[in-house]
């Protein structure tokens, strides 16, 4: 059967807690991606920035989820209206905003 | 030491609103990743959740219940307030309030309560 | 909503016996499952949270166990003071919803 968006969401949001708690080295070698805005498509705009992140086994489980909650394809190099305009963070600082905001929607029922 | 406790009338009309008040000592809801429930429990009965408030003021009801509901913090009096609209006998329960915390995951579990405040609502 | 189902509603144990008592919910709610305490004229207490974890001062006779829809709480020897009615609950998200309770009566 298929999984409650909500549970969905839970899943997401545990996979980037395990990854902000078991980071030892810098994630992904310190990768830097474009930052995006968190306001509205949060799951595209996301899976945007991290998919031109490669060889990094850390966050590939979190780039499937994202797929999972994004309608459109996405592809590396393709980039939306929803990223910040020049500025990139290190991945580590990407996920850690991404799980505060994700956190918040689930708090407030928004799982879609 | 983390206590809660609840005030509320004791005895309501049918019709008329509820408010109940839960003082929080020991912790803060300006804290991140605190919350507060309320849960009521009918005479002889079960236990069900009525709503939740989190540290920055996102709010949850129980469906059933929620266009009768209201809950709202006053963090300066370290205070959550509940009202519940036209009352009815059925609404008659020990109220209880509630502390989450949450951090890292989502837990939503209470782990300490109020002692609890009887409402009866009968005219 | 999620309901949540637990049997036996009442049971009758000896002091010394190891007591189950089962929580059913009508989803995967991925261990997100609390259970609680409540002793007549009182309010409830948090016993165990997420499937397994001991909430700070609960003796260590009470453990909790399950995955998926399925969980139980197990009192492995049984006191006088153990004598309560158990909820359990689920934690995944709002609505929050309880078990019917299970009372536990000394023989």
């Known amino acids: 059967s298929p999984v409650p968006p909500s549970t969905a969401l839970k899943e997401l949001i545990e996979e980037l807690v395990n990854i902000t708690q078991n980071q030892k080295a810098p994630l992904c070698n310190g990768s830097m991606v474009w930052s995006i805005n968190l306001t509205a498509g949060v799951y595209c705009a996301a899976l945007e920035s991290l998919i031109n992140v490669s060889g990094c086994s850390a966050i590939e489980k979190t780039q499937r989820m994202l797929n999972g909650f994004c309608p459109h394809k996405v592809s590396a190099g393709q980039f939306s209206s929803l990223r910040v305009r020049d500025t990139k963070i290190e991945v580590a600082q990407f996920v850690k905003d991404l799980l505060v905001h994700l956190k918040k929607l689930f708090r407030e029922g928004q799982f879609n | 030491e983390v206590t809660l406790r609840e005030s509320g009338p004791g005895l309501v009309k049918p019709t008329q609103t509820l408010t109940l008040t839960c003082t929080l000592y020991?912790?803060?809801?300006?804290?991140?990743?605190?919350?507060v429930d309320w849960i009521r429990q009918p005479p002889g009965k079960g236990l069900e959740w009525l709503a939740h408030?989190?540290?920055?003021?996102?709010?949850r009801y129980n469906p059933a219940l929620k266009s009768r509901l209201t809950i709202s913090k006053d963090t300066s009096k370290n205070q959550v307030v509940l009202k519940l609209t036209s009352v009815d006998p059925v609404d008659t329960a020990t109220y209880y309030c509630?502390?989450?915390?949450?951090?890292?995951?989502?837990?939503?579990?209470?782990?300490?309560w109020g002692q609890g405040t009887l409402v009866t609502v009968s005219s | 909503d999620i309901q949540m189902t637990q049997s036996p509603s009442s049971l009758s144990a000896s002091v010394g016996d190891r007591v189950t008592i089962s929580c059913r919910a009508s989803?995967?709610?991925?261990?997100?499952l609390n259970w609680y305490q409540q002793k007549p004229g009182k309010a409830p207490k948090l016993l165990i949270f997420?499937?397994?974890k001991l909430h700070s001062g609960v003796p260590s006779r009470f453990s909790g166990s399950g995955s998926g829809t399925d969980y139980t709480l197990t009192i492995s020897s049984l006191q006088p003071e153990d004598i309560a009615t158990y909820y359990c609950?689920?934690?995944?998200?709002?609505?929050?919803?309880f078990g019917g309770g299970t009372k536990v009566e000394i023989k």
């Open positions: 509630a502390r989450t915390v949450s951090s890292g995951y989502i837990y939503y579990a209470m782990d300490y």
């Open positions: 020991g912790f803060s809801l300006s804290t991140s990743d605190m919350g």
């Open positions: 408030i989190w540290w920055d003021d996102v709010k």
């Open positions: 989803q995967d709610i991925r261990n997100y």
């Open positions: 997420y499937t397994s």
């Open positions: 609950q689920q934690g995944l998200t709002p609505p929050l919803t």
